[in-house]
């Protein structure tokens, strides 16, 4: 039986400040049963950049319809970057459960933020 | 087309056990979460069982009781049932499940569904 | 659990009229909630998910409105074909799924 896999395509984006900053991530099945989440950074001092159900994120929207069918494409677009934003972003798989269990990651994709052409 | 065909509902006596199975077809079985929901005769509908991969939910009202398994090389979902009670007795309906947005799940193909009648 | 209550239990109703359905949920369920259609001796069958989402073949003269707590399905000009009993189901906080106790429109 096939692994579930998390897919990260890019290792590294670039982008000028001011601008969006779009993350890829793919997921290789529906299954086991579980949410989606992406943090920057990895450890226990991570910080959450996005989750579906719970928390505002004002500057991070999914790339996909979030009504869409059977969605296994969990890209997301941050806006407004600036050099505070750098850092590597992961994508992480989460097992359903009281509380929910870490999964499976991606391997990462690490941000980097030009400065802004003048 | 998505079909999915139930069978292994009959009738039995309190404690005893029985195994139903729903054969699948029309779809990527391997993938995606399957269910059981029930329906007691004259009432409404009762979620009994869900199994992702390896992972497996049920309700309060079968725990330790009914076991949902899997076979993707048969595309078929097992419901084994054991310590059967009068109130076990409904139709068992097989759904496949479908994901929206970033998590949820709700069911957008079901079977015809097998009577399982629990009766001394 | 959240508990899913829905409203009237039966409905009388003529072919042609606006048809509107309530299902409340005992908590904020977000819009994770899908509404099946059952007839008499046969399996459900989606409708409606993510509150306003039809299903594919879904006639237009259904639709779901609502978010929260509150969410309606109105059948715009009901056909005979529509009888039957409607759920509703939540799925923002599983498990347990669970199911509104359905209500019933009879054709008049």
């Known amino acids: 039986e096939e692994e579930l896999q998390v897919i990260q395509p890019e290792k590294s984006v670039s982008v000028a400040a001011g601008d969006s900053a779009t993350l890829n991530c793919t997921v290789s099945s529906l299954i086991p049963v579980g949410p989606i989440q992406w943090f920057r950074g990895a450890g226990p001092g991570r910080e959450l950049i996005y989750n579906l159900k719970e928390g505002h994120f004002p500057r991070v929207t999914p790339v996909s319809d979030p009504t869409k069918r059977n969605n296994m494409d969990f890209s997301i677009r941050i806006s407004n970057i600036t050099p505070a934003d750098a850092g590597t972003y992961y994508c992480v798989k989460f097992r359903k459960g009281s509380p929910d269990v870490e999964l499976k990651s991606g391997a990462g994709t690490e941000l980097s933020v030009r400065a802004k052409p003048s | 087309d998505v079909q999915l065909v139930e069978s292994g509902g009959g009738v039995v006596r309190p404690g005893e056990s029985l195994r139903l199975s729903c054969a699948a077809s029309g779809f990527s079985f391997s993938i995606y979460a399957m269910s059981w929901v029930r329906q007691a005769p004259g009432e409404g509908l009762e979620w009994v069982s869900t199994i992702g991969a390896d992972d497996t939910y049920y309700a309060d009202s079968v725990k330790g009781r009914f076991t949902i398994s899997r076979d993707n090389s048969k595309n078929t979902l097992y419901l084994q049932m054991n310590s059967l009670r009068a109130e076990d007795t409904a139709v068992y309906y097989c759904a496949k499940d479908s994901t929206v947005g970033w998590s949820g799940d709700f069911f957008d193909y079901w079977g015809l569904g097998t009577l399982v009648t629990v009766s001394s | 659990e959240i508990v899913l209550t829905q409203s009237p239990a039966t409905l009388s109703v003529s072919p042609g009229e606006r048809v509107t359905l309530s299902c409340r949920a005992s908590q904020n369920v977000r819009s994770d909630i899908a509404w099946y259609q059952q007839k008499p001796g046969q399996a459900p069958r989606l409708l409606i998910y993510a509150a306003s989402s039809r299903d594919t073949g879904i006639p237009a003269r259904f639709s779901g409105s609502g978010s929260g707590t509150d969410f309606t399905l109105t059948i715009s000009s009901l056909q005979s074909e529509d009888f039957g009993v409607y759920y509703c189901?939540?799925?923002?906080?599983?498990?347990?799924?669970?199911f509104g106790g359905g209500t019933k429109v009879e054709i008049k």
């Open positions: 189901q939540q799925y923002y906080d599983w498990p347990p799924f669970t």
